[in-house]
């Protein structure tokens, strides 16, 4: 799978994580920080 950083257009997309652009899948993906979940890392869990 080809990956790159997300474009500036997606700044702020991942609330608590790193935004990765999955080129072959034509979509952005959020790699969440520890303790966060959700498509955009918007949920905190203990």
């Amino acid at each position: 799978v080809s990956i790159t950083k997300c474009s500036s257009d997606m700044n702020g997309y991942c609330l608590h994580g790193q935004c990765i652009y999955l080129v072959d899948m034509s979509q952005n993906y959020c790699r969440c920080e520890v303790g966060y979940t959700g498509v955009r890392c918007e949920h905190f869990f203990l």
């Epitope: 474009s7 257009d9 702020g12 652009y21 080129v23 034509s26 979509q27």
Partner: antibody, heavy 116, light 106 residues
């Protein structure tokens, strides 16, 4: 299957406002950004602006600042684009476009006609 | 705001011809460019994103290349069903479309 279903065609008088809706099904708009694009008859595509439904943040193209308002209701999974002070040059097909979890998935378009 | 200059605005070519469309950005867009095909009365159809990544179901005669500010879209062998208007879109910083290229059969 994912869908963006837009409201029906509108006819408005110059100076009036129009509000176009874009209802999502099959996915949560909070996971995406919703963009709005328009196309006047026989003309090219023009990006108008976008909303982040999760945060409510908006970005607009400079030429539409103060005249366009993009909103989202996450409880109904629907985004809206309102354009005020309509003039004949605003006659166009208006599209909502999902980006984020999937690159640029388009609604079917809504024709807005501005005529006296 | 990033501006996209697309050329030519229209072209006429024969079936089987190689067709090339260019888009020049006003600043580096880091390969974040997409190409759309639009036929009359239809919504635009995404063909290529991230400069050269073909979407599923798109014929291999379509291709894209480029970097920095200069990008190219190519139809290697024009087919009758390719008659349409093609647009580039930069999505590096917000979004801007090129002016479009109308492709006709000679």
């Amino acid at each position: 299957q994912d869908q963006l279903v837009q409201s029906g065609a509108e006819v408005k008088k110059p100076g009036a406002s129009v509000k176009v809706s874009c209802k999502a099904s099959g996915f949560n708009i909070k996971d995406t950004y919703i963009q709005w694009v328009r196309q006047a008859p026989g003309q090219g595509l023009e990006w108008m602006g976008r909303i982040d439904p999760l945060r409510g943040n908006t970005k607009y193209r400079e030429k539409f600042e103060g005249r366009v308002t993009i909103t989202a209701d996450t409880s109904t999974n629907t985004a809206y684009m309102e354009l005020s002070s309509l003039r004949s040059e605003d006659t166009a097909v208006y599209y909502c476009v999902r980006s984020g979890t999937l690159f640029d998935f388009w609604g079917q378009g809504t024709l807005v006609t501005v005529s006296s | 705001r990033i501006q996209m200059t697309q050329s030519p605005s229209s072209l006429s070519a024969s079936v089987g011809d190689r067709v090339t469309i260019t888009c020049k950005a006003s600043q580096d867009i880091h390969k974040y460019i997409a190409w759309y095909q639009q036929k009359p009365g239809q919504a635009p159809r995404l063909l290529i994103q991230y400069t050269s990544t073909l979407q599923p179901g798109v014929p291999s005669r379509f291709s894209g290349s480029g970097s920095g500010t200069d990008y190219t879209f190519t139809i290697s062998s024009l087919q009758p069903e390719d008659i349409a208007t093609y647009y580039c879109l930069q999505y590096d910083n917000l979004r801007t479309f090129g002016g479009g290229t109308k492709v006709e059969i000679k």
